[in-house]
């Protein structure tokens, strides 16, 4: 980088080299230049010479300031205009960076998806700090007192084989950058309130022809989790409004969901799960999408055959219950 | 354009002090590094100090150490050299220069006469 | 501090004549090796800097050369206008330093 050059002389900024975005700056340039009394100094940004507010300091510096800097990032160096040189003479270069502290963490969450073997841990860092930002992520147990930390740079994996302080911790995250630091609530968690049942896929899905048309989606998941509850949601892709079916679903076989559909129409699928009465859901599975037939023939739609535009985390699975309208879209 | 202009003629006693002005004008003394250079009659030229960009400081011929200055005025862009302790062998023709390494441009001169 | 040594001291020429006048440093000065020339009653004026680099405005009939301790200032073709007082000046190491001089005087 700029910052690597062999300088014959020395450039700082003012107040630092990292700074609070939209703030007043000062960048200062001196000459350190054997037999050069500089006529001239020079500032570029980013390669570019600035043309304003250069003000001579004494014989060998100067100082350019800037009014409300929003660059996120900059190279700076500067030059002298040194009598006898035919060209001007490079004295020394810095990258400079704004941005802003880190706002407080809020929304931390922990979850262990399972089979993963690790316990997930993410927040809302806030809005967008443009410089490096680090997270230190704190599980305190709460039966031994003793307490973890990581670093990380946005969220954390922590193996559940190194949470040897029994069942019960406090997770808190603190973040820090060069222009601030700032630290979230605790969060209590219970390992083992917080697993995730592993992904509920849907498989396929087959219109059979009767009295009355109906669609039958085959979905299932891994999991080992006995008491598992779950959600579909279904619309016609025209549609702005989810249809949501509730389930109490064993995954001891595949599940099978009946739903009763209007002929010729493309419908879009997505399951999700939770451990029964616990607080985190598996997020939306892929979409899986199904048109029903104008008539009589009997369809089926593959796992295969759905859209991959649309991926993400595939979780889910249904028996049978109750529909509901829903328009919230994806669920914490 | 750098133009010097230098004070007048000056004549001291043994002992006493002399302050000789160099007015700068095309350049600011914020531009210029300022030396100062004497010529005894009839002798060669003797360096006697001047700004040094590269350390960022006057530097004063061994010789004259403890008894020379050069102080800037750049509201005025007007430089001096104040030399005391005169002796006869102070005697002669001073002259302010720029732009240090080498020199490119000087004053007129001014003579300084120490006679009892 | 860097002794400079000139000579000759005094140079007798004609018009015409080439004139070469040299400059030894008691040490290694690089290329920082300037030339002046000085008439009477009149400031130094900047002939070469570097040691061979001519001043905007000075004559190519002047030339210099040279680097480390040996330095030569050589006017090809003596002109009227040049007899005068030609000095050297190292400025690689304060405190600066000029030799003694040599006056090119007319034949």
């Known amino acids: 980088g700029i910052t690597n050059i062999n300088c014959s002389g020395h450039i700082w900024v003012e107040p630092a080299t990292i700074f609070k975005m939209g703030m007043n700056i000062s960048i200062y340039c001196q000459a350190a230049i054997k037999n050069c009394q500089p006529r001239k100094l020079h500032f570029y940004k980013n390669g570019i010479k600035e043309r304003f507010q250069i003000t001579r300091i004494n014989k060998t510096t100067a100082r350019l300031w800037y009014k409300n800097f929003l660059e996120p990032h900059a190279s700076m160096y500067c030059t002298a205009e040194c009598p006898k040189h035919f060209q001007e003479t490079l004295i020394c270069g810095k990258d400079i960076s704004s941005g802003y502290p880190p706002d407080i963490p809020d929304e931390v969450t922990c979850v262990i998806y399972e089979y993963s073997g690790n316990m997930t841990c993410t927040w809302n860092a806030g809005k967008l700090t443009y410089i490096d930002t680090k997270y230190v992520v704190h599980v305190k147990s709460l039966e031994t007192e003793e307490e973890q930390q990581y670093l990380t740079s946005s969220y954390i994996n922590i193996s559940t084989d190194s949470l040897q302080g029994g069942k019960k911790y406090l997770v808190w995250v603190q973040a820090a950058n060069a222009l601030g630091m700032e630290e979230s609530k605790q969060l209590q968690i219970h390992l083992d309130d917080i697993v995730i049942p592993s992904a509920a896929v849907i498989s396929r899905a087959e219109t059979i022809n009767a009295t009355v048309p109906k669609t039958i989606i085959y979905w299932d998941s891994q999991t080992t989790i006995e008491k598992v509850s779950c959600e579909m949601r279904y619309k016609a892709t025209t549609n702005q409004t989810w249809n949501v079916k509730e389930f109490d679903t064993n995954f001891t076989y595949v599940q099978q969901s009946e739903f009763y559909l209007e002929p010729n129409i493309k419908y879009v699928f997505q399951v999700r799960c939770q451990e029964t009465g616990k607080r985190y859901w598996q997020p939306w599975s892929s979409l899986f999408f199904h048109k029903t037939p104008e008539t009589v023939p009997q369809v089926t739609s593959k796992a295969f055959q759905h859209d991959t535009w649309n991926s993400g985390l595939t979780v889910a699975s249904i028996s049978t219950g109750h529909l509901t309208s829903d328009n919230r879209g994806d669920i914490g | 354009q750098v133009q010097m202009v230098q004070s007048g003629a000056e004549v001291k006693r043994p002992g006493a002090s002399v302050k000789v002005s160099c007015k700068v004008s095309g350049y600011t003394l914020n531009e210029l590094g300022i030396h100062w250079v004497r010529q005894a009659p009839g002798k060669g030229l003797e360096w006697m100090g001047g700004?040094?960009?590269?350390?960022?400081?006057?530097i004063y011929a061994q010789r004259f150490q403890g008894r020379l200055t050069m102080p800037e005025d750049t509201s005025t862009d007007t430089a001096y050299m104040e030399l005391s302790s005169l002796t006869s062998e102070d005697t002669a023709v001073y002259y302010c220069a720029t732009v240090a390494a080498p020199l490119d441009y000087w004053g007129q001169g001014t003579l300084v006469t120490v006679s009892s | 501090d860097i002794q400079m040594t000139q000579s000759p001291s005094t140079l007798s020429a004609s018009v015409g004549d080439r004139v070469t006048i040299t400059c030894r440093a008691s040490?290694?000065?690089?290329?920082?090796l300037a030339w002046y020339q000085q008439k009477p009653g009149k400031a130094p004026k900047l002939l070469i800097y570097k040691a061979s680099s001519l001043e905007s405005g000075v004559p190519s009939r002047f030339s210099g050369s040279g680097s480390g301790t040996e330095f030569t200032l050589t006017i090809s073709s003596l002109q009227p206008d040049d007899f005068a007082t030609y000095y050297c000046q190292q400025y690689d190491i304060y405190s600066w330093t000029f030799g003694q001089g040599t006056k090119v005087e007319i034949n």
């Open positions: 700004f040094d960009p590269e350390h960022g400081k006057i």
């Open positions: 040490q290694s000065i690089s290329s920082w």
